[in-house]
Interface confidence: low
């Protein structure tokens, strides 16, 4: 592993990204550590404010974590010749608040992208598709990791955060080859209706630690390759028949449902019946009721129809709360 020793004398290599001269074979950007044997460049916790322009052409794994990049402009990684081998790009925790359209263009081998732990006030609809065409060239991305990218409330745009992320995921149908999508810890209240339909190759979907209340308008039907669906730590109250049937119809799926505030009333009967016979839910014996109070901590699998009642609806004159 070689450490960087270049200084400002390397300025000729810091011309505009697209026109920069090819880096020397053994060059390592300042504030980075490079290993040609591992095809890895790490520029980690160095408070970088922009992506180094003089990245070595051999780079396959690029870590730019723990920096202060703020903005990723269009062509942030465009080089001449291109970084044709770059397969895994980790930008987590780099204080990004804006990712513009075409930020990842000219990375023909990019399989894995991690933007986690960046407060993305603005994610362009064309961040991953690279163009505003209705059908774009397919992105090479196989794994997209977007955990905890929700900005603080005071930095949010007027439009919904869920909608902004969804627009980037579906634009140009570019992510049809995506196998893994992680969207944990984003305060999502809902999942926009059309997103999953545009991601037919998904094998792993992580929506854990959000605030999803219902999956009623979400369709999993076309996710025939889905192997893992993580819905732990949300605000789910019950799964209805349509959702249950869709999940049961997926040939390989494992669903994770721990730590949701299940409401064990008459509306839960179908889900309990399904849980007792399905092999789809991992750790289903751990699922417990949160409401109503009299049912708290009861194990869903131990319930029968007699346990699952709904209070009669009182006329308005008798309602006290």
């Amino acid at each position: 592993t070689s450490s960087a020793s270049s200084s400002s004398s390397s300025a000729p290599f810091l011309a505009s990204a697209a026109s920069a001269q090819p880096p020397l074979p053994d060059q390592c950007p300042a504030l980075c550590e490079c290993s040609e044997a591992a095809r890895t460049v790490k520029c980690v916790n160095r408070n970088l404010t922009e992506v180094p322009t003089d990245l070595p052409l051999y780079v396959r794994n690029l870590f730019l974590t723990g920096n202060q990049l703020a903005v990723l402009p269009a062509g942030a990684f465009a080089r001449r010749p291109p970084l044709a081998e770059l397969a895994a790009l980790n930008l987590s925790g780099s204080r990004l608040d804006e990712v513009r359209g075409g930020a990842f263009e000219h990375l023909p081998s990019l399989r894995q992208l991690d933007l986690s732990h960046n407060p993305l006030a603005y994610l362009s609809p064309f961040a991953f598709s690279g163009s505003n065409a209705s059908i774009s060239a397919p992105s090479p991305l196989v794994e997209l990791i977007l955990n905890h990218i929700v900005p603080p409330d005071d930095k949010r745009q007027n439009r919904s955060f869920e909608g902004m992320v969804a627009a980037a995921l579906v634009a140009g149908r570019a992510l049809q080859g995506l196998h893994l999508l992680e969207l944990a810890s984003n305060h999502f209240l809902y999942l926009p209706r059309d997103v999953l339909a545009q991601l037919p190759s998904l094998r792993y979907l992580d929506l854990s630690n959000n605030s999803l209340v219902s999956l009623t308008y979400v369709s999993f039907r076309n996710l025939t390759h889905l192997e893992s669906l993580h819905l732990e730590d949300n605000a789910l109250k019950v799964l209805h028949n349509g959702t249950l049937a869709e999940l049961q119809g997926l040939p390989h799926v494992r669903v994770f449902l721990d730590n949701n505030p299940w409401v064990c009333d008459c509306h839960m009967a179908d889900m309990v019946t399904w849980l007792k016979q399905t092999g789809v839910v991992q750790g289903k014996d751990r699922l417990t009721c949160a409401f109503p109070e009299k049912m708290r901590n009861r194990v869903l699998l131990e319930l029968n129809s007699a346990d699952l009642d709904c209070d009669p609806i009182l006329p308005p004159s008798l309602q006290t709360s």
């Epitope: 591992a38 081998e85 894995q112 196989v142």
Partner: antibody
């Protein structure tokens, strides 16, 4: 059904060469990275080499670097391991295996293996 | 290179009981969101078979009595309840970096 069938093993003298083949069927070979893994008699598993789906990336274990070359012929659904300067410690069962994605997943299908014996 | 140390080297478990196998890595093989550790089963005369990928994800077709857990440097494979057909050698393997390495193996015998 996914199938991987290795061939080319046998008895080789120290210093000699051998080329192993692995023929794939039942899946789109050109979409998968491929590995060679070996297992010496009565011992554990040792990863040997990897080649990416489009042959742009190669990795080797230090123990074989400079002596072994991994390659593939996607139209023919075949993976190769060219071995030169063979040593007695290269004696092992050689398995080919596929990996579905860069990095994250395990080796999800393996062939039955072919035995290489390096001895005079 | 990352060294994977499995323990115990062998164990004998009564039918229907729990078998627990540990794997310790010489450095972390987990990112903030994922673990690059996998478990395999190998029976005599057969190739290894993937059981668990990425620490805890059961491979399609593998019985639910197999489960995996752990992150960072410490990982565990559990089999419960153990069945006769689980007699085999079990290996952990990381894919954090090149070279991939395997643990030394744990031989499981059913009493």
């Amino acid at each position: 059904d996914v199938q991987l069938v290795e061939s080319g093993g046998g008895l080789v003298q120290p210093g000699g060469s051998r080329k192993l083949s692995c023929t794939a069927s039942g899946f789109t070979f050109s979409n998968f990275g491929m590995h060679w893994v070996r297992q010496a008699p009565e011992t554990g598993l040792e990863w040997v080499a990897y080649i990416s789906s489009g042959s742009s990336t190669f990795y080797y274990a230090d123990s074989v670097k400079g002596r072994f070359t991994i390659s593939r012929d996607n139209p023919k659904n075949t993976l190769f391991l060219q071995m030169t300067s063979l040593r007695s410690e290269d004696t092992a069962m050689y398995f080919c295996a596929r990996s579905p994605a860069y990095y994250r997943y395990g080796l999800d299908y393996w062939g039955q293996g072919t035995t290489l014996t390096v001895s005079s | 290179d990352i060294v994977l140390t499995q323990s115990p080297a062998s164990l004998a478990v009564s039918l229907g009981q729990r078998a627990t196998i540990s794997c310790r890595a010489s450095q972390s093989v987990s990112s903030s969101t994922f673990s690059y550790m996998h478990w395999y089963q190998q029976k005599p005369g057969q190739p290894p078979k993937l059981l668990i990928k990425s620490s805890s994800n059961l491979e399609s077709g593998v019985p639910a009595r197999f489960s995996g857990s752990g992150s960072g440097t410490d990982f565990t494979l559990n089999i419960h309840p153990v069945e006769e057909e689980d007699t085999a050698t079990y290996y952990c393997q990381h894919s954090w970096e090149i070279p991939y390495t395997f643990g030394g193996g744990t031989k499981l015998e059913i009493k």
